[in-house]
Interface confidence: low
Protein backbone atom coordinates (compact mmCIF):
# COMPACT_ATOMS: atom_id res chain seq x y z
CA UNK A 1 0.00 0.00 0.00
CA UNK A 2 1.49 3.33 -1.08
CA UNK A 3 0.71 6.70 0.51
CA UNK A 4 -0.96 9.55 -1.35
CA UNK A 5 -1.65 13.15 -0.33
CA UNK A 6 -5.29 14.19 0.09
CA UNK A 7 -6.32 17.81 0.69
CA UNK A 8 -9.64 19.07 2.02
CA UNK A 9 -10.83 22.32 3.66
CA UNK A 10 -10.38 22.69 7.40
CA UNK A 11 -13.84 24.05 8.20
CA UNK A 12 -17.24 24.09 6.50
CA UNK A 13 -20.52 25.42 7.85
CA UNK A 14 -23.62 23.48 6.83
CA UNK A 15 -26.50 25.44 5.35
CA UNK A 16 -29.71 26.04 7.28
CA UNK A 17 -31.18 23.10 5.36
CA UNK A 18 -28.50 20.77 6.70
CA UNK A 19 -26.39 20.55 3.55
CA UNK A 20 -22.60 20.75 3.58
CA UNK A 21 -20.32 20.68 0.54
CA UNK A 22 -16.56 20.46 0.28
CA UNK A 23 -13.87 19.49 -2.19
CA UNK A 24 -11.57 16.55 -1.64
CA UNK A 25 -8.45 16.71 -3.83
CA UNK A 26 -5.89 13.95 -4.19
CA UNK A 27 -2.43 13.97 -5.74
CA UNK A 28 -2.68 11.01 -8.07
CA UNK A 29 0.78 9.49 -8.58
CA UNK A 30 -0.37 7.48 -11.59
CA UNK A 31 -3.22 7.05 -14.05
CA UNK A 32 -5.91 5.40 -11.98
CA UNK A 33 -9.00 4.14 -13.79
CA UNK A 34 -10.98 3.14 -10.69
CA UNK A 35 -11.16 5.33 -7.59
CA UNK A 36 -12.96 4.76 -4.30
CA UNK A 37 -13.90 7.71 -2.11
CA UNK A 38 -15.03 7.20 1.47
CA UNK A 39 -16.24 9.85 3.90
CA UNK A 40 -15.55 9.05 7.54
CA UNK A 41 -16.89 10.95 10.53
CA UNK A 42 -14.77 11.30 13.64
CA UNK A 43 -16.51 12.40 16.82
CA UNK A 44 -15.68 11.59 20.42
CA UNK A 45 -12.70 9.52 19.21
CA UNK A 46 -15.07 7.22 17.33
CA UNK A 47 -14.79 6.85 13.55
CA UNK A 48 -17.78 5.80 11.47
CA UNK A 49 -18.25 5.50 7.71
CA UNK A 50 -20.71 8.08 6.39
CA UNK A 51 -20.75 7.01 2.75
CA UNK A 52 -18.59 5.57 0.01
CA UNK A 53 -18.53 5.52 -3.77
CA UNK A 54 -16.44 3.68 -6.32
CA UNK A 55 -16.21 5.33 -9.71
CA UNK A 56 -14.41 5.02 -13.01
CA UNK A 57 -12.32 8.01 -14.03
CA UNK A 58 -14.30 10.15 -16.45
CA UNK A 59 -17.63 8.79 -15.26
CA UNK A 60 -20.09 10.20 -12.77
CA UNK A 61 -19.54 9.64 -9.07
CA UNK A 62 -22.42 7.44 -7.93
CA UNK A 63 -23.11 6.88 -4.27
CA UNK A 64 -25.40 4.09 -3.21
CA UNK A 65 -29.12 4.73 -2.97
CA UNK A 66 -29.06 4.56 0.82
CA UNK A 67 -26.40 7.24 1.01
CA UNK A 68 -26.78 10.76 2.40
CA UNK A 69 -23.92 11.84 0.10
CA UNK A 70 -23.85 12.98 -3.48
CA UNK A 71 -20.83 13.99 -5.49
CA UNK A 72 -19.19 14.80 -8.77
CA UNK A 73 -15.65 14.18 -9.92
CA UNK A 74 -13.39 16.29 -12.08
CA UNK A 75 -9.86 15.10 -12.63
CA UNK A 76 -8.27 14.59 -9.23
CA UNK A 77 -11.00 16.50 -7.42
CA UNK A 78 -14.16 15.14 -5.87
CA UNK A 79 -16.92 17.59 -4.94
CA UNK A 80 -18.78 16.05 -2.03
CA UNK A 81 -22.17 17.06 -0.65
CA UNK A 82 -23.62 15.63 2.54
CA UNK A 83 -27.33 16.12 3.13
CA UNK A 84 -29.72 15.75 6.02
CA UNK A 85 -27.29 16.99 8.65
CA UNK A 86 -28.44 18.08 12.09
CA UNK A 87 -26.62 19.72 14.98
CA UNK A 88 -25.83 16.31 16.45
CA UNK A 89 -23.91 15.48 13.23
CA UNK A 90 -21.31 18.20 13.86
CA UNK A 91 -17.89 16.60 13.67
CA UNK A 92 -14.73 16.00 11.68
CA UNK A 93 -15.45 14.53 8.24
CA UNK A 94 -12.44 12.79 6.77
CA UNK A 95 -11.98 12.12 3.07
CA UNK A 96 -10.31 8.81 2.27
CA UNK A 97 -9.27 8.13 -1.32
CA UNK A 98 -8.15 4.77 -2.69
CA UNK A 99 -6.79 4.18 -6.17
CA UNK A 100 -8.18 0.71 -6.72
CA UNK A 101 -7.09 -0.08 -10.25
CA UNK A 102 -4.72 -0.62 -11.92
CA UNK A 103 -2.02 -1.65 -9.42
CA UNK A 104 -0.26 -0.45 -7.39
CA UNK A 105 -2.92 0.33 -4.78
CA UNK A 106 -2.65 3.84 -3.29
CA UNK A 107 -4.31 5.09 -0.13
CA UNK A 108 -4.69 8.69 0.96
CA UNK A 109 -6.46 10.10 3.99
CA UNK A 110 -7.16 13.80 4.45
CA UNK A 111 -6.82 15.72 7.69
CA UNK A 112 -10.58 16.13 7.85
CA UNK A 113 -13.11 18.91 7.42
CA UNK A 114 -14.80 20.14 10.59
CA UNK A 115 -18.46 20.49 9.63
CA UNK A 116 -20.54 22.65 11.93
CA UNK A 117 -24.28 22.12 11.81
CA UNK A 118 -26.68 24.49 13.53
CA UNK A 119 -30.31 23.45 13.71
CA UNK A 120 -32.47 26.32 12.48
CA UNK A 121 -34.68 28.09 14.98
CA UNK A 122 -38.34 27.20 14.43
CA UNK A 123 -40.17 30.05 12.71
CA UNK A 124 -42.84 31.68 14.89
CA UNK A 125 -46.40 31.49 13.61
CA UNK A 126 -47.26 34.56 11.61
CA UNK A 127 -50.57 36.05 10.47
CA UNK A 128 -49.92 37.05 6.87
Amino acid sequence: CKAMHVAQPAVVLASSRGIASFVCEYASPGKATEVRVTVLRQADSQVTEVCAATYMMGNELTFLDDSICTGTSSGNQVNLTIQGLRAMDTGLYICKVELMYPPPYYLGIGNGTQIYVIDPEPCPDSDF
Epitope: R36, T38, T48, E49, C51, A52, A53, T54, Y55, M56, N59, E60, T62, L64, D65, D66, S67, I68
Partner: antibody
Protein backbone atom coordinates in the same frame (compact mmCIF):
# COMPACT_ATOMS: atom_id res chain seq x y z
CA UNK B 1 -44.25 -6.21 -16.53
CA UNK B 2 -40.55 -6.22 -15.61
CA UNK B 3 -38.84 -9.48 -16.53
CA UNK B 4 -35.24 -10.70 -16.35
CA UNK B 5 -34.64 -13.89 -18.29
CA UNK B 6 -31.31 -15.65 -17.83
CA UNK B 7 -29.48 -18.13 -20.03
CA UNK B 8 -29.44 -21.86 -19.35
CA UNK B 9 -27.31 -24.04 -17.10
CA UNK B 10 -23.60 -24.48 -17.83
CA UNK B 11 -21.17 -27.31 -17.07
CA UNK B 12 -17.53 -26.21 -17.13
CA UNK B 13 -14.12 -27.64 -16.32
CA UNK B 14 -11.78 -26.00 -13.79
CA UNK B 15 -9.76 -23.21 -15.41
CA UNK B 16 -12.38 -22.55 -18.09
CA UNK B 17 -14.56 -19.45 -18.51
CA UNK B 18 -18.31 -19.01 -18.57
CA UNK B 19 -20.39 -16.18 -20.01
CA UNK B 20 -24.05 -15.92 -19.06
CA UNK B 21 -26.75 -13.50 -20.14
CA UNK B 22 -29.69 -11.69 -18.61
CA UNK B 23 -32.27 -10.25 -21.00
CA UNK B 24 -34.36 -7.43 -19.56
CA UNK B 25 -37.83 -6.36 -20.67
CA UNK B 26 -40.73 -4.28 -19.37
CA UNK B 27 -38.68 -1.18 -18.54
CA UNK B 28 -36.07 1.16 -20.00
CA UNK B 29 -32.88 -0.90 -19.75
CA UNK B 30 -30.53 2.07 -19.45
CA UNK B 31 -32.42 3.60 -16.51
CA UNK B 32 -31.28 1.06 -13.92
CA UNK B 33 -28.02 -0.60 -12.96
CA UNK B 34 -27.89 -4.38 -13.22
CA UNK B 35 -26.35 -6.35 -10.36
CA UNK B 36 -25.12 -9.93 -10.21
CA UNK B 37 -25.41 -12.11 -7.12
CA UNK B 38 -24.44 -15.74 -6.67
CA UNK B 39 -25.49 -18.50 -4.30
CA UNK B 40 -23.70 -21.80 -3.77
CA UNK B 41 -25.95 -24.73 -2.89
CA UNK B 42 -27.20 -24.43 0.67
CA UNK B 43 -25.19 -21.23 1.19
CA UNK B 44 -25.92 -17.52 1.41
CA UNK B 45 -26.05 -14.74 -1.16
CA UNK B 46 -22.88 -13.07 -2.42
CA UNK B 47 -22.78 -9.83 -4.41
CA UNK B 48 -20.45 -9.92 -7.42
CA UNK B 49 -20.84 -6.45 -8.87
CA UNK B 50 -22.99 -4.16 -10.96
CA UNK B 51 -22.99 -2.27 -14.22
CA UNK B 52 -24.58 0.98 -15.33
CA UNK B 53 -25.97 0.11 -18.80
CA UNK B 54 -25.90 3.76 -19.82
CA UNK B 55 -22.27 4.63 -19.07
CA UNK B 56 -21.11 0.98 -18.88
CA UNK B 57 -19.25 1.83 -15.69
CA UNK B 58 -18.90 -1.02 -13.23
CA UNK B 59 -18.37 -1.70 -9.54
CA UNK B 60 -17.02 -5.05 -8.43
CA UNK B 61 -16.70 -6.94 -5.20
CA UNK B 62 -12.91 -7.07 -4.76
CA UNK B 63 -13.19 -10.84 -4.35
CA UNK B 64 -14.14 -11.07 -8.03
CA UNK B 65 -12.00 -8.24 -9.35
CA UNK B 66 -10.01 -9.40 -12.38
CA UNK B 67 -12.01 -12.63 -12.76
CA UNK B 68 -15.49 -11.28 -13.42
CA UNK B 69 -16.38 -8.95 -16.28
CA UNK B 70 -19.76 -7.29 -16.60
CA UNK B 71 -20.91 -5.98 -19.97
CA UNK B 72 -24.15 -4.93 -21.66
CA UNK B 73 -25.64 -4.87 -25.14
CA UNK B 74 -27.98 -1.90 -25.10
CA UNK B 75 -29.50 -2.76 -28.48
CA UNK B 76 -30.89 -6.03 -27.12
CA UNK B 77 -31.35 -4.89 -23.46
CA UNK B 78 -29.10 -7.71 -22.33
CA UNK B 79 -26.54 -7.82 -19.53
CA UNK B 80 -23.69 -10.31 -19.49
CA UNK B 81 -21.38 -11.67 -16.88
CA UNK B 82 -18.20 -13.55 -17.71
CA UNK B 83 -16.30 -15.42 -15.01
CA UNK B 84 -12.82 -16.70 -15.81
CA UNK B 85 -10.41 -19.20 -14.26
CA UNK B 86 -13.27 -21.21 -12.85
CA UNK B 87 -12.76 -23.28 -9.70
CA UNK B 88 -14.94 -25.91 -8.08
CA UNK B 89 -16.07 -23.38 -5.46
CA UNK B 90 -17.55 -21.23 -8.25
CA UNK B 91 -20.29 -23.85 -8.58
CA UNK B 92 -23.40 -21.84 -7.79
CA UNK B 93 -26.60 -20.32 -9.10
CA UNK B 94 -25.88 -16.88 -10.57
CA UNK B 95 -28.66 -14.29 -10.49
CA UNK B 96 -29.05 -10.95 -12.20
CA UNK B 97 -31.14 -8.44 -10.29
CA UNK B 98 -32.17 -4.88 -11.04
CA UNK B 99 -31.05 -1.91 -8.97
CA UNK B 100 -33.58 0.69 -7.93
CA UNK B 101 -33.45 4.43 -7.53
CA UNK B 102 -34.98 7.05 -5.27
CA UNK B 103 -38.45 5.92 -6.32
CA UNK B 104 -38.10 2.19 -6.96
CA UNK B 105 -36.91 -0.41 -4.48
CA UNK B 106 -33.59 -2.08 -5.22
CA UNK B 107 -33.41 -5.78 -6.08
CA UNK B 108 -37.18 -6.03 -6.46
CA UNK B 109 -36.72 -7.96 -9.72
CA UNK B 110 -34.57 -11.06 -10.14
CA UNK B 111 -33.80 -13.42 -12.97
CA UNK B 112 -34.58 -17.12 -12.52
CA UNK B 113 -30.87 -17.89 -12.10
CA UNK B 114 -28.21 -19.68 -14.13
CA UNK B 115 -26.70 -22.79 -12.58
CA UNK B 116 -22.97 -23.06 -13.23
CA UNK B 117 -21.35 -26.37 -12.33
CA UNK B 118 -17.55 -26.56 -12.30
CA UNK B 119 -16.31 -30.11 -12.32
CA UNK B 120 -13.50 -32.09 -13.87
CA UNK C 1 -16.50 -4.50 4.14
CA UNK C 2 -19.57 -4.42 6.36
CA UNK C 3 -20.22 -7.86 7.81
CA UNK C 4 -23.83 -8.75 8.62
CA UNK C 5 -24.44 -11.43 11.25
CA UNK C 6 -27.89 -12.96 11.49
CA UNK C 7 -29.25 -14.74 14.51
CA UNK C 8 -30.39 -17.32 15.11
CA UNK C 9 -29.15 -19.42 12.19
CA UNK C 10 -32.27 -21.57 12.51
CA UNK C 11 -35.52 -20.69 14.25
CA UNK C 12 -38.02 -23.47 14.94
CA UNK C 13 -41.53 -22.22 15.69
CA UNK C 14 -45.14 -23.24 15.25
CA UNK C 15 -47.81 -21.46 13.19
CA UNK C 16 -49.45 -18.73 15.23
CA UNK C 17 -46.29 -17.93 17.18
CA UNK C 18 -44.30 -14.68 16.99
CA UNK C 19 -40.94 -14.74 15.20
CA UNK C 20 -38.06 -12.32 15.77
CA UNK C 21 -35.09 -12.42 13.40
CA UNK C 22 -32.02 -10.29 14.12
CA UNK C 23 -29.31 -8.81 11.93
CA UNK C 24 -26.24 -7.13 13.38
CA UNK C 25 -23.85 -5.03 11.26
CA UNK C 26 -20.12 -4.70 11.93
CA UNK C 27 -20.48 -0.93 11.43
CA UNK C 28 -23.39 1.46 11.20
CA UNK C 29 -25.64 1.24 8.14
CA UNK C 30 -28.27 3.67 6.92
CA UNK C 31 -30.97 1.10 6.27
CA UNK C 32 -31.38 -2.65 6.35
CA UNK C 33 -33.20 -4.62 3.66
CA UNK C 34 -34.64 -8.12 3.94
CA UNK C 35 -35.21 -10.90 1.40
CA UNK C 36 -37.25 -14.06 1.64
CA UNK C 37 -36.12 -17.17 -0.21
CA UNK C 38 -37.75 -20.54 -0.62
CA UNK C 39 -35.89 -23.66 -1.86
CA UNK C 40 -35.15 -23.64 -5.57
CA UNK C 41 -36.44 -20.10 -6.05
CA UNK C 42 -34.80 -16.69 -6.50
CA UNK C 43 -34.84 -14.41 -3.45
CA UNK C 44 -37.75 -11.99 -3.12
CA UNK C 45 -37.43 -8.47 -1.79
CA UNK C 46 -39.46 -8.56 1.42
CA UNK C 47 -38.72 -5.43 3.46
CA UNK C 48 -36.69 -2.45 2.26
CA UNK C 49 -35.33 0.70 3.86
CA UNK C 50 -35.61 -0.98 7.29
CA UNK C 51 -39.39 -0.93 7.61
CA UNK C 52 -41.16 -0.65 4.24
CA UNK C 53 -42.98 -3.80 3.18
CA UNK C 54 -42.46 -4.77 -0.44
CA UNK C 55 -45.50 -5.16 -2.66
CA UNK C 56 -47.68 -8.09 -1.61
CA UNK C 57 -45.99 -8.70 1.74
CA UNK C 58 -48.58 -9.31 4.50
CA UNK C 59 -48.97 -6.74 7.29
CA UNK C 60 -48.00 -9.32 9.92
CA UNK C 61 -44.40 -8.61 8.87
CA UNK C 62 -42.57 -5.59 10.23
CA UNK C 63 -39.01 -4.30 10.26
CA UNK C 64 -37.23 -2.03 12.70
CA UNK C 65 -33.81 -0.95 13.92
CA UNK C 66 -31.08 1.59 13.37
CA UNK C 67 -27.30 1.87 13.41
CA UNK C 68 -25.96 -1.66 13.74
CA UNK C 69 -28.96 -3.61 15.04
CA UNK C 70 -32.01 -4.51 12.98
CA UNK C 71 -34.98 -6.82 13.40
CA UNK C 72 -37.56 -8.51 11.21
CA UNK C 73 -40.68 -9.51 13.16
CA UNK C 74 -43.60 -11.73 12.17
CA UNK C 75 -46.49 -11.20 14.57
CA UNK C 76 -48.33 -14.49 13.94
CA UNK C 77 -46.64 -17.13 11.80
CA UNK C 78 -48.52 -18.70 8.93
CA UNK C 79 -47.49 -21.78 6.95
CA UNK C 80 -46.32 -19.72 3.96
CA UNK C 81 -43.87 -17.73 6.11
CA UNK C 82 -41.50 -20.65 6.67
CA UNK C 83 -38.47 -19.86 4.51
CA UNK C 84 -34.96 -18.44 4.75
CA UNK C 85 -34.60 -14.70 5.36
CA UNK C 86 -31.52 -12.68 4.43
CA UNK C 87 -30.65 -9.16 5.53
CA UNK C 88 -28.67 -6.87 3.20
CA UNK C 89 -26.91 -3.53 3.44
CA UNK C 90 -26.49 -1.04 0.64
CA UNK C 91 -24.72 1.65 2.62
CA UNK C 92 -21.27 0.90 1.22
CA UNK C 93 -19.57 -1.28 -1.35
CA UNK C 94 -19.29 -4.18 -1.49
CA UNK C 95 -22.98 -4.79 -0.95
CA UNK C 96 -23.24 -7.58 1.61
CA UNK C 97 -25.83 -10.06 2.83
CA UNK C 98 -26.20 -11.84 6.13
CA UNK C 99 -25.72 -15.61 6.16
CA UNK C 100 -29.47 -16.12 6.52
CA UNK C 101 -31.95 -17.28 9.16
CA UNK C 102 -33.89 -20.43 8.32
CA UNK C 103 -37.39 -20.28 9.78
CA UNK C 104 -38.68 -23.84 10.08
CA UNK C 105 -41.84 -25.47 11.37
CA UNK C 106 -41.45 -26.93 14.85
Amino acid sequence: EVQLVQSGAELKKPGASVKMSCKASGYTFTDYNMDWVRQAHGKGLEWIGNINPNSESTSYNQKFKGRATLTVDKSSSTAYMELRSLRSDDTAVYYCTRDGNRYDAWFAYWGQGTLVTVSS
Amino acid sequence: EIVLTQSPATLSLSPGERATLSCSASSSVTYMHWFQQKPGKAPKLWIYSTSILASGVPARFSGSGSGTDYTLTISRLEAEDFATYYCQQRTSYPLTFGQGTKLEIK
